[in-house]
Amino acid sequence: CKAMHVAQPAVVLASSRGIASFVCEYASPGKATEVRVTVLRQADSQVTEVCAATYMMGNELTFLDDSICTGTSSGNQVNLTIQGLRAMDTGLYICKVELMYPPPYYLGIGNGTQIYVIDPEPCPDSDF
């Protein structure tokens, strides 16, 4: 057995509509059938959960209806999208992967993706 490695991009720039997407890839040491993916935001020493989803291998991952995250899975790769971001949400977003079943449990934590969010300039009033 060996520890699980998780890879994610170092930097992502959110779109002008406040949407950021990145890939979280894990090197699975075992044959997991149930995987939990969590996105955590680290600001200073505080870590807060942004969203989490558990999925069965081969199935789609589904976040809660009120989640700001959506995602798709393909093998050992998860494509994550975070919506509704504003400039104040700029920060380090960490991908945490847990192989929940069958035992043994494995933990993998990425180094984090720095997401930069720039609020769009308000449109100037037109004189027409």
Partner: antibody
């Protein structure tokens, strides 16, 4: 603030059962993995079991597998450890502990409850 | 299961001295934590992720290492630092602890 309070320890005969409880406050119980860790008198720490998040997954240490059952009631913010077929070597202080968001290291611990298995 | 080996078993030092505690894991991992335990008390988290200090831990405590060899260093021992220290791996279940190192007053 986060608090964990264990109860249910005591003296029990070999082969008998006991149920430990751990009441949590100050955080959302279902967002964390919750663990039991024990320490035999004068010995080191031994991880016993974990229940994950919504309670659908549980993992156990080899020495208690098949005898101990971990469970939780999220509505009561309470963690349980049902201990069956107790042996003398199960004598220990049992701690409940919260696994942190970034992994199963334990940022908060209860004060512990002593279980003595003796005839 | 992953085996953690701590050394030395006991460290006899004087206040103000530097303490260096070792933890070796049987499998390479960065998911390593350190705890301090005093008699009659629950353990207290010091370090996680091999080198990150937990909230409220004085900066005289530092963790280092990677792969299979890890170190907890107490730069200048204070009277309240004399205790037993445990390392723990949390990357793969079952989560395991080292046997502990007792830091005692010389």
């Amino acid at each position: 603030q986060v608090q964990l309070v264990e109860s249910g320890g005591g003296v029990v005969q070999p082969g008998r059962s006991l149920r430990l409880s751990c009441t949590a406050s100050g955080f959302t119980f279902s967002n964390y993995g919750m663990h039991w860790v024990r320490q035999a008198p004068g010995k080191g720490l031994e991880w016993v079991a974990v229940i994950w998040y919504d309670g659908s997954n549980k993992h156990y240490g080899d020495s208690v597998k098949g005898r101990f059952t971990i469970s939780s009631d999220n509505s009561k913010n309470t963690l349980y450890l049902q201990m069956n077929s107790l042996r003398a070597e199960d004598t220990a202080v049992y701690y409940c502990a919260r696994g942190e968001r970034l992994g199963s290291y334990f940022d908060y611990w209860g004060q512990g409850t002593l279980v003595t298995v003796s005839s | 299961e992953i085996v953690l080996t701590q050394s030395p078993g006991t460290l006899s030092l004087s206040p103000g001295e530097r303490a260096t505690l070792s933890c070796r894991t049987s499998v390479s991992s960065s998911y390593l934590a350190w705890y301090q335990q005093k008699p009659g008390q629950a353990p207290r988290l010091l370090i996680y992720g091999a080198s990150s200090r937990a909230t409220g831990i004085p900066d005289r405590f530092s963790g280092s290492g990677s792969g299979t060899d890890f170190t907890l260093t107490i730069s200048r021992l204070e009277p309240e630092d004399f205790a037993v220290y445990y390392c723990q791996q949390y990357g793969i279940s079952p989560f395991t602890f080292g046997g502990g190192t007792k830091v005692e007053i010389k």
